[in-house]
């Protein structure tokens, strides 16, 4: 069953390479278990860069060596990717799986467009 | 680093199906991100399948998704590239390749240092 997803359009990263951006989903009922994944489009290429399982009112936990952090409020999943350079610009997308209890419903959203730009080096001083 | 040798080429018709393997020795395999590339004759090596080192990740290049999967069995030492509904511009040498780095946004930008001899997949009738 399909199931809206928003996330922002655009996002900044910092000059440290750290981007964050809220992923909100219209949960139909009372779901328990939740999967959030994010999605790189760019470069004719599709990336699962990070994953995440979560109980409702508990931590994210992440997949793998994630660059990928997060916390849950509600139907609101706060997520944030470190690491990142300016070859990293892309779209992101926001997909979430309702696991548990059935009926299994999935919303992908959009996608934020996130921009990275690395920090000019210091010029030498004297 | 990790030793690979690839299995599994063969000539397939259009539409068919094959499955390649990917068989490491040395190195602590599940240190490795693993990725398939491929070149066809007269062109550049081109980013295929990538999969993360527990194997909980992948990323695929847009003209094999849906169509190709990438799997590890890290126990085995063995990564594993299926292809289905092959067309003849799939046809090229398959190679696999080790990476000994985490998983970030651009896996087919990773450091690559371990490579295969690669396989040949031909697509024809």
């Known amino acids: 069953k399909a199931m809206h997803v928003a996330q922002p359009a655009v996002v900044l990263a910092s000059s440290r390479g750290i981007a964050s951006f809220v992923c909100e989903y219209a949960s139909p009922g009372k779901a328990t278990e939740v999967r959030v994944t994010v999605l790189r489009q760019a470069d004719s290429q599709v990336t699962e860069v990070c994953a995440a399982t979560y109980m409702m009112g508990n931590e994210l936990t992440f997949l793998d060596d994630s660059i990928c952090t997060g916390t849950s409020s509600g139907n609101q999943v706060n997520l944030t990717i470190q690491g990142l350079r300016a070859m990293d610009t892309g779209l992101y997308i926001c997909k979430v799986e309702l696991m548990y209890p059935p009926p299994y419903y999935l919303g992908i959203g959009n996608g934020t467009q996130i921009y990275v730009i690395d920090p000019e080096p210091c010029p030498d001083s004297d | 680093e990790v030793q690979l040798v690839e299995s599994g080429g063969d000539l397939v018709q259009p539409g068919g199906s094959l499955r390649l393997s990917c068989a490491a020795s040395?190195?602590?395999?599940?240190?490795?991100?693993v990725g398939w590339f491929r070149q066809a004759p007269g062109k550049d090596r081109e980013f295929v399948t990538a999969?993360?080192?527990?194997?909980?990740?992948?990323a695929y290049a847009d003209s094999v998704k849906d169509r190709f999967t990438i799997s590890r069995d890290n126990a085995k030492k063995m990564a594993y590239l299926q292809m289905n509904s092959l067309k003849p511009e799939d046809t090229a040498v398959y190679y696999c390749?080790?990476?000994?780095?985490?998983?970030?946004?651009?896996?087919?930008?990773?450091?690559?240092?371990?490579w295969g001899q690669g396989t040949q997949v031909t697509v024809s009738s």
């Open positions: 390749a080790g990476a000994p780095v985490p998983w970030g946004a651009r896996p087919s930008l990773f450091t690559y240092d371990s």
């Open positions: 040395g190195r602590t395999f599940s240190n490795y991100t």
């Open positions: 999969i993360s080192r527990s194997g909980s990740l992948k």
